[in-house]
């Protein structure tokens, strides 16, 4: 516990209890202490979301969430004379804020968004039932490193879904990551409702496809040798080498984390290389190597996308059938 | 051959500190992770956490964050798993493992015993 | 965080019968960072398969894996007296509780 002593008696309530939106899914709720607080009372602040999650006890007179604003949220706030969760707090007061105005049917739907190769943010999304197909639509933007607001200029369409990407680059500061980039959708007309999305950005990362340099035999053993892409450390991928071999039919899958090119077959010392040595392979046939990345999920919370494959390299024969 | 030795057997009393070391050997330290388990007696593996000795990046299950510290010198190829101060219920076997970016143990310690007692 | 459950906690079967385990994890897992272990009394676990379906170095072919989302199998196509054991299913932070394989 903390605070100074807790009087029997409840608090009164807070005043002034206000809310506001900054950026594009920060809320801010503040409010002023209670008028006619006991004296002796050193104040806290209980409050929690109207669904009675995130339940906090503190000393500050505001209280913020990053959270989209697709849907009605609302805070509850009151006065206790202690850090303790059991002392009855004050009546409760509730400040709620909706979203913007407009015909939920209208707004977009699964907007997605993914951080290609640390590089640039492609976001997608389908177009909402109740929507003319000649809607222009808006994609705004921001993250902490940005003063303000950005508005997407790329807007494309791939089929039923429209898009638009914009460069987000992996800032040195170690933090940048554990922080989450606000996405808004409307059209410029005003008619459909908004659409709101937060992407952490330890989520739905997609490395660049590796690009394979030299494949070459040594006895029985095939050496690749590959590019790693760019922006990522070496504890954060992971590849899937893949070899298929035209006279036995067979595909056979190789995971590879030691990457270092550091055998006598492959070309040394070059920048951002990754080697590996694939065992029994027969060097009278043909062989296809392609390769692939993807994140390690300790350092990127997203597990499930994969790189595209590199393009294909061959080395070996291809034996006439006889 | 990569192999993981771990230091021996400790029995401790309630408050102390321990420090147990786990040494790695037959391939590159720096390029793969060490996770440690915890295994309590007669029950199942627990993921305690993982330390990356290349940069010393760790990370720890919810379970374990701030109950142990996780470090490694890669000068001596070693990682280790401390305690501040000991409980009872930290009496099990340790092992550490050598953990590729895709998450299995592939290779293991033989274990460390760690009896807290009175 | 994602929960492994696995089934059954014990089965009961005869040198050169098949086994089939069964892992279920609490939401779509990529079979990537699935793998399988095997642990015998006073020992350390083995790897046996990452990925979901690689048979680590060393392992013999009568144990595979398969799988994909929530869903995964290990299987031991003809038991040895040496794979009567614990084994247990990994996804990073997440072990399952174990099924052991007992002689009948």
């Known amino acids: 516990g903390g605070g100074g002593a807790a009087p029997t008696e409840t608090q009164p309530p807070v005043t002034n209890l206000s809310v506001s939106v900054e950026n594009l899914c920060t809320v801010i709720w503040t409010w002023n202490p209670p008028e006619g607080a006991s004296s002796n009372c050193s104040l806290w602040y209980f409050s929690h979301f109207g669904d009675k999650q995130d339940k906090k006890i503190a000393p500050e007179t505001r209280r913020s969430i990053e959270v989209p604003l697709n849907e009605r949220i609302c805070l509850q706030v009151g006065s206790q004379c202690s850090t303790n969760e059991s002392e009855k707090p004050s009546i409760l007061v509730e400040k709620c804020i909706s979203p913007p105005e407009g015909d939920p049917e209208s707004a977009v739907t699964e907007l997605q968004c993914i951080w290609h190769n640390l590089s640039y943010m492609k976001c997608s999304w389908l177009p909402g039932r109740n929507t003319s197909p000649d809607t222009n639509y808006t994609l705004y933007y921001w993250h902490r490193s940005l003063e303000k607001i950005h508005q997407c200029e790329n807007i494309f369409r791939e089929g039923q879904y429209f898009g638009c990407s914009f460069d987000l680059t992996k800032v040195k500061d170690s933090s940048f990551e554990q922080h989450s980039v606000q996405i808004m959708v409307k059209d410029n007309a005003g008619k459909i409702k908004p659409s709101f999305n937060i992407v952490p950005l330890t989520s739905r990362v997609k490395p660049d496809p590796p690009h394979i340099k030299n494949l070459s035999f040594h006895n029985d053993d095939l050496y690749v040798q590959w590019e790693n892409p760019q922006n990522f450390i070496s504890r954060c991928l992971f590849y899937e080498v893949e070899v298929n071999n035209s006279q036995t039919e067979t595909h056979n899958v190789f995971y590879v984390q030691e990457a270092k090119c550091e055998n006598p077959e492959f070309e040394r010392n070059v920048e951002n290389t990754s080697c590996f040595m694939v065992p029994g392979v027969l060097p009278d046939t043909l062989n296809t190597v392609r390769i692939r990345v993807k994140t390690n999920k300790l350092c990127y919370e997203d597990d499930k996308l994969w790189s595209n494959w590199s393009q294909e390299m061959s080395i070996g024969k291809k034996r006439n059938s006889t | 051959e990569v192999q993981l030795v771990q230091s021996g057997a400790e029995v401790k009393k309630p408050g102390e500190s321990l420090k147990i070391s786990c040494k790695g050997s037959?391939?590159?330290?720096?390029?793969?992770?060490i996770g440690w388990v915890r295994q309590m007696p007669g029950k199942g593996l627990e993921w305690m956490g993982v330390?990356?000795?290349?940069?010393?990046?760790?990370r720890y299950s919810p379970s374990f964050q701030g109950q142990v510290t996780i470090s490694a010198d890669k000068s001596i190829s070693t990682a280790y798993l401390q305690w501040s101060s000991l409980k009872a219920s930290d009496t099990a076997m340790y092992y550490c493992?050598?953990?590729?970016?895709?998450?299995?143990?592939?290779?293991w310690g033989q274990g460390t015993l760690v009896t807290v007692s009175s | 965080e994602i929960v492994l459950t696995q089934s059954p906690g014990t089965l009961s079967l005869s040198p050169g019968e098949r086994a089939t385990l069964s892992c279920r994890a609490s939401?779509?897992?990529?079979?990537?960072?699935l793998a399988w272990y095997q642990q015998k009394p006073g020992q350390a676990p083995r790897l046996l398969i990452y990925?979901?379906?690689s048979r680590a170095t060393g392992i013999p072919d009568r144990f595979s894996g398969s799988g994909s989302g929530t869903d995964f199998t290990l299987t031991i196509s003809r038991l040895e007296p040496e794979d009567f054991a614990v084994y247990y299913c990994?996804?990073?932070?997440?072990f399952g509780q174990g099924t052991k394989v007992e002689i009948k």
């Open positions: 330390i990356y000795p290349g940069d010393s990046y760790t």
């Open positions: 990925g979901a379906s």
């Open positions: 037959g391939y590159s330290f720096t390029s793969y992770w």
């Open positions: 939401q779509s897992i990529s079979s990537s960072y």
């Open positions: 990994q996804q990073y932070a997440s």
């Open positions: 493992a050598r953990m590729p970016n895709w998450g299995s143990l592939d290779h």
